[in-house]
C-alpha cells in the first residue's frame, strides 16, 4: 500500500512539476524591467525565451518574437535547449510512469517490469527537473551579470547629464515557476525511485543452507517481514507479500513465483 501511495504521489508531483516546466518555458516574464527607483512606469519591458514584450501605461501590450536563431546569445540558446530537453524527458517519463503505476493493470505485466519502468521514469523525472533547474539558474546568472554591468554603465563615465538610461532587467515570475517546477519534478523522480525499490521482487538466496536446531522455526511478523532470530536468519529482512507464517525450511523447499503476488 505504501509503495502504491509513494508511486502515485511521485507521479502526481512529477506531473505538476512538468506542467510547471512547460508553463515556465512558455512564459514571457523570464526577465522584467527593474523598477529600482520608479515603481510606476509608462513603458514596462519584459522578456521571455521566445519573445520580448512591452506594456504601455494604457495596458497596450506588444510582443515581438525572436525571429532569428544565429543572432541570439548562446546562453539563451542553451537555456532553451535545457528547458526543451527537460520537457521532453519529463513527457516520456510521464508516459512510462503511467504504465508503471501499480494501480493500473496492463495485461500480465510482471512486477519486475513495473519496477524497472518506475525506476526509468524516476530517473527521467530527476534529469528533467535538473535540466529545468539548470536552465533557470543559467538564465538567472546571465541576468545578474547583465544587471551589474548595466548598473556600472549607468553610473560611470557619464560626466554630467545622463543621455541614455539603460534598461536593467531583474528576475521575472517564470524563473520562480521554473525553480519550483524543477524541484517538484526532481522530488517526484526521487519518490518514483523509492517506490521502485518496494516494487522490485528481490529473490531469496536459495543456495545458502541454514543450520539450526530441529523444530526451531522462524516466525513472520504480521507485516510480512521476517523476524530476526539472529541465528541462521536472513538479516536483510526481505519482504514477502503473502504475509503467511511459514518455517524457513518450507520457504526453501517450495520456492514459487506465487510467493510474490
Amino acid at each position: 500500500m505504501a509503495v502504491t501511495a509513494c508511486q502515485g504521489l511521485g507521479f502526481v508531483v512529477s506531473l505538476i512539476g512538468i506542467a510547471g516546466i512547460i508553463a515556465a518555458t512558455c512564459m514571457d516574464q523570464w526577465s522584467t524591467q527593474d523598477l529600482y527607483n520608479n515603481p510606476v512606469t509608462a513603458v514596462f519591458n519584459y522578456q521571455g525565451l521566445w519573445r520580448s514584450c512591452v506594456r504601455e501605461s494604457s495596458g497596450f501590450t506588444e510582443c515581438r518574437g525572436y525571429f532569428t536563431l544565429l543572432g541570439l546569445p548562446a546562453m539563451l540558446q542553451a537555456v532553451r535547449a535545457l528547458m526543451i530537453v527537460g520537457i521532453v524527458l519529463g513527457a516520456i517519463g510521464l508516459l512510462v510512469s503511467i504504465f508503471a503505476l501499480k494501480c493500473i493493470r496492463i495485461g500480465s505485466m510482471e512486477d519486475s517490469a513495473k519496477a524497472n519502468m518506475t525506476l526509468t521514469s524516476g530517473i527521467m523525472f530527476i534529469v528533467s527537473g535538473l535540466c529545468a533547474i539548470a536552465g533557470v539558474s543559467v538564465f538567472a546568472n546571465m541576468l545578474v551579470t547583465n544587471f551589474w554591468m548595466s548598473t556600472a554603465n549607468m553610473y560611470t563615465g557619464m560626466g554630467g547629464m545622463v543621455q541614455t538610461v539603460q534598461t536593467r532587467y531583474t528576475f521575472g515570475a517564470a524563473l520562480f515557476v521554473g525553480w519550483v517546477a524543477g524541484g517538484l519534478t526532481l522530488i517526484g523522480g526521487v519518490m518514483m525511485c523509492i517506490a521502485c525499490r518496494g516494487l522490485a521482487p528481490e529473490e531469496t538466496n536459495y543456495k545458502a543452507v541454514s543450520y539450526h536446531a530441529s523444530g526451531h522455526s522462524v516466525a513472520y511478523k504480521p507485516g510480512g517481514f521476517k523476524a530476526s532470530t539472529g541465528f541462521g536468519s536472513n538479516t536483510k529482512n526481505k519482504k514477502i507479500y503473502d504475509g503467511g507464517a511459514r518455517t524457513e525450511d518450507e520457504v526453501q523447499s517450495y520456492p514459487s513465483k506465487h510467493d510474490y503476488v
Epitope: 520608479n38 494604457s58 495596458g59 515581438r64 541614455t164
Partner: antibody
Framework: EIQLQQTGPELVKPGASVTISCKTS????????MLWVKQSHGKSLEWIGN????????TYNLKFKGKATLTVDRSSSTAYMQLNSLTSEDSAVYYC?????????????WGQGTSVTVSS | DIVMTQSPYSLSVSTGEKVTMSCKSS????????????LAWYQQKPGQPPKLLIY???TRESGVPDRFTGSGSGTDFTLTISSVQAEDLALYYC?????????FGGGTKLEIK
C-alpha cells in the same frame, strides 16, 4: 463621434476647492486611460496625472500630488479632477485627454478645456 | 524628470515653404524592448485644445495631412511641414511619452508671413 465634454469656466477664491468634470461619449470609457493636463496662461503644458477608469488606479505627477485628486464615475462615463487649497498659481486652463491605447502613450482626444481663475 | 527643449521659439514663414522644428530630450526616449521612440507632437491653434499630429516619433495620426512628418530617434527629434498652409498657424509641442512624469517642450510658435 468621440467627445470629451468639460464643465464651463470657474472663478474661485484662494484656499477653496474646485471640481472639474469631463463627460465622455462615443467610446468605451473603461477601456482608455484618462489624463489631465494643465496649461497656465501663455505657458506650456504640464501633465497632472492619469486614471485608469476600469480599476480607478491613479498615477500622479509628484508636483500635483496632494493638489489634484482624480476620480471617475463609470456609470456616467465621467472623469473628475478636484483641485484643493487653490492659489493664484493654480489659475490655468485644465484639459482632460484620452490616452490613445496603442499610440505610444500619446493623447488622441482632448476636452475643450476648463478655465480656472483663482481670485479674491 | 525628462526635460524637453524645443527650438526655435518662433518661426515666421510664407505659405508653401518647408519648415523644420527641433525637439531635444535630456534622456533617450528610445525603448529597446520594442525599438520604438516614445515622443509625440501636438498642434495647438489659438483658443483650442492641443491636437495629436505624430506619435511614436514618426507615425502620423489618422486624419493628419501628409505634409506633417516626424523623424529622429533617442534624444533628437524633428517635425517637418513640407509645404506650410495658412491653417498651420499654431503652437507645436513635443511630449515625452516614455517616462513619468510626462513632460512637454516649451513649444514652437509658427507664424505665417
Amino acid at each position: 463621434e468621440i467627445q470629451l465634454q468639460q464643465t464651463g469656466p470657474e472663478l474661485v477664491k484662494p484656499g477653496a476647492s474646485v471640481t472639474i468634470s469631463c463627460k465622455t461619449s462615443g467610446y468605451s470609457f473603461t477601456d482608455y486611460l484618462m489624463l489631465w493636463v494643465k496649461q497656465s496662461h501663455g505657458k506650456s503644458l504640464e501633465w497632472i496625472g492619469n486614471i485608469n477608469p476600469y480599476y480607478g488606479r491613479t498615477t500622479y505627477n509628484l508636483k500635483f500630488k496632494g493638489k489634484a485628486t482624480l476620480t471617475v464615475d463609470r456609470s456616467s462615463s465621467t472623469a473628475y479632477m478636484q483641485l484643493n487649497s487653490l492659489t493664484s498659481e493654480d489659475s490655468a486652463v485644465y484639459y482632460c485627454a484620452r490616452d490613445g491605447y496603442s499610440l505610444r502613450n500619446a493623447m488622441d482626444y482632448w476636452g475643450q478645456g476648463t478655465s480656472v481663475t483663482v481670485s479674491s | 524628470d525628462i526635460v524637453m527643449t524645443q527650438s526655435p521659439y518662433s518661426l515666421s514663414v510664407s505659405t508653401g515653404e518647408k519648415v523644420t522644428m527641433s525637439c531635444k530630450s535630456s534622456q533617450s526616449l528610445f525603448n529597446s524592448g520594442n525599438q520604438k521612440n516614445y515622443l509625440a507632437w501636438y498642434q495647438q491653434k489659438p483658443g483650442q485644445p492641443p491636437k495629436l499630429l505624430i506619435y511614436g516619433a514618426s507615425t502620423r495620426e489618422s486624419g493628419v495631412p501628409d505634409r506633417f512628418t516626424g523623424s529622429g530617434s533617442g534624444t533628437d527629434f524633428t517635425l517637418t511641414i513640407s509645404s506650410v498652409q495658412a491653417e498651420d498657424l499654431a503652437l507645436y509641442y513635443c511630449q515625452n511619452a516614455h517616462s513619468y512624469p510626462y513632460t512637454f517642450g516649451g513649444g514652437t510658435k509658427l507664424e505665417i508671413k
